[in-house]
């Protein structure tokens, strides 16, 4: 699986999850998030050669098409597969609020 | 929605579904598919600026991150959202078989 266990331990050029730390204030301008200061959102990148973690029949077909027609602009793209939530602390006035934001952390990727 | 109705009628540079005809024999080397000869598989392409048909909170965050950090390599990618099946005819020896291949035709795209 193209997950953090594999991708963070290997120098993988093809589609894989990559570490990306995002600081809420500096990188997003989100001053309203008090905790955490930032988090590992991660991201997916790398080429999608034929059959590499193909998401659907279409991505398999497109991967083969791209292999046999290298000049073609159509090819699958490396995108998030499994995502995890992130719990944040923020304030509404003087009242603290804790919220779980869904799909914030990429744990694995796929070719779609 | 970034679907065929919209994308095929507009000159859209950003993420959209694009027409792509695939000939089974010529483009994939699939001699075993007898009907249809080919089909419009279509594909997704184009930049994913902040908030454009964002698939998840992560893609929204990544889109914003990319806007504020233009030099960053991390950005959402334009990939299939809705896919439709395709019915094909092939032969197993001298016996005709009809099969519905799922997720073969891209009808709309999203930024993921």
């Amino acid at each position: 699986a193209l997950d953090t266990n594999y991708c963070f331990r290997n120098l993988e050029e093809n589609c894989c999850v990559r570490p990306l730390y995002i600081d809420f204030r500096q990188d997003l301008g989100w001053k309203w998030v008090h905790e955490p200061k930032g988090y590992y959102a991660n991201f997916c990148s790398g080429p999608c050669p034929y059959l590499r973690s193909a998401d659907t029949t279409h991505s398999t077909v497109l991967g083969l098409y791209n292999t046999l027609n290298p000049e073609a602009s159509a090819s699958p793209c490396c995108v998030p597969q499994d995502l995890e939530p992130l719990t944040i602390l923020y304030y509404v006035g003087r009242t603290p609020k804790v919220e779980q934001l869904s799909n914030m952390v990429v744990k694995s990727c796929k070719c779609s | 929605a970034l679907d065929t109705n919209y994308c095929f009628r507009n000159l859209e540079e950003n993420c959209c579904v694009r027409p792509l005809y695939i000939d089974f024999r010529q483009d994939l080397g699939w001699k075993w598919v007898h009907e249809p000869k080919g089909y419009y598989a279509n594909f997704c392409s184009g930049p994913c600026p902040y908030l454009r048909s964002a698939d998840t909170t992560h893609s929204t965050v990544l889109g914003l991150y990319n806007t504020l950090n233009p030099e960053a390599s991390a950005s959402p990618c334009c990939v299939p959202q809705d896919l439709e099946p395709l019915t094909i005819l092939y032969y197993v020896g001298r016996t005709p078989k009809v099969e519905q291949l799922s997720n073969m035709v891209v009808k709309s795209c999203k930024c993921s």
Partner: antibody
Framework: EVQLVESGGGLVQPGPSLRLSCTAS????????MSWVRQAPGKGLELVAD??????????YYSDSVKDRFTISRDDSKSIVYLQMNSLKTEDTAVYYC??????????WGQGTLVTVSS | DIQLTQSPSSLSASVGDRVTITCRAS??????????MHWYQHKPGKQPKLLIY???NLASGIPSRFSGSGSGTDFTLTISSLQPEDFATYYC?????????FGGGTKVEIK
């Protein structure tokens, strides 16, 4: 260009054997089923024998009129299909065509070879 | 086995005529939207030639005056304007199941 060339036909008395050959070129022979179709004088086309590719275990078919007398075989290394005809009868007199069916239709045909069974 | 019955067994026509040949199967030769019926032209001393495959698809190099239609058990071959070189015997053939069989043929003669 697809070419199918039959050979081996001729005049033979009832009873003995004859082997027809069909040499194929211009297509991926190994991938496709091959057939022998005949036309007897004044009659229509009849599929007499058929053999599919190795992928489908070289499965064969014979029409009732030739079953247990005729044998179809193929040599993929030489791109040749054979029709071994034993215990020939006068009603086997016909033009025998070699043909290839990539799908459900017989797309290409040889020029035919005449087999005459007569005493 | 599926039997194919062609009609008429023979017909006389003139150059320029519209000719229609029918082929009826003893059971359906269609599967889903695919119609597994094919048509051939056979001239004396020549090998048969594929005209139409899967009921309505024109084979490579065949003039557009030839057309096919039908589904299920009833199929038609039409020659829109008969030409001198079209005088021949025409056969239908199915591939719905093994064994594939041919119709008895329709001989098109000069009137």
């Amino acid at each position: 260009e697809v070419q199918l060339v039959e050979s081996g036909g001729g005049l033979v008395q009832p009873g003995p054997s004859l082997r027809l050959s069909c040499t194929a070129s211009g297509f991926d022979f190994n991938s496709y089923g091959m057939s022998w179709v005949r036309q007897a004088p004044g009659k229509g086309l009849e599929l007499v024998a058929d053999i599919v590719s190795k992928t489908y275990n070289y499965t064969t078919y014979y029409s009732d009129s030739v079953k247990d007398r005729f044998t179809i075989s193929r040599d993929d290394s030489k791109s040749i299909v054979y029709l071994q005809m034993n215990s020939l009868k006068t009603e086997d007199t016909a033009v025998y065509y070699c043909t290839v069916a990539p799908g459900g239709s017989f797309d290409y045909w040889g020029q035919g070879t005449l087999v005459t069974v007569s005493s | 086995d599926i039997q194919l019955t062609q009609s008429p067994s023979s017909l006389s026509a003139s150059v320029g005529d519209r000719v229609t040949i029918t082929c009826r199967a003893s059971q359906s030769v269609s599967i889903s939207r695919f119609n597994l019926m094919h048509w051939y032209q056979h001239k004396p001393g020549k090998q048969p030639k594929l005209l139409i495959y899967r009921a309505s698809n024109l084979a490579s190099g065949i003039p557009s005056r030839f057309s096919g239609s039908g589904s299920g058990t009833d199929f038609t071959l039409t020659i829109s304007s008969l030409q001198p070189e079209d005088f021949a015997t025409y056969y239908c053939q199915h591939s719905r199941e093994s064994p594939w069989t041919f119709g008895g043929g329709t001989k098109v003669e000069i009137k």
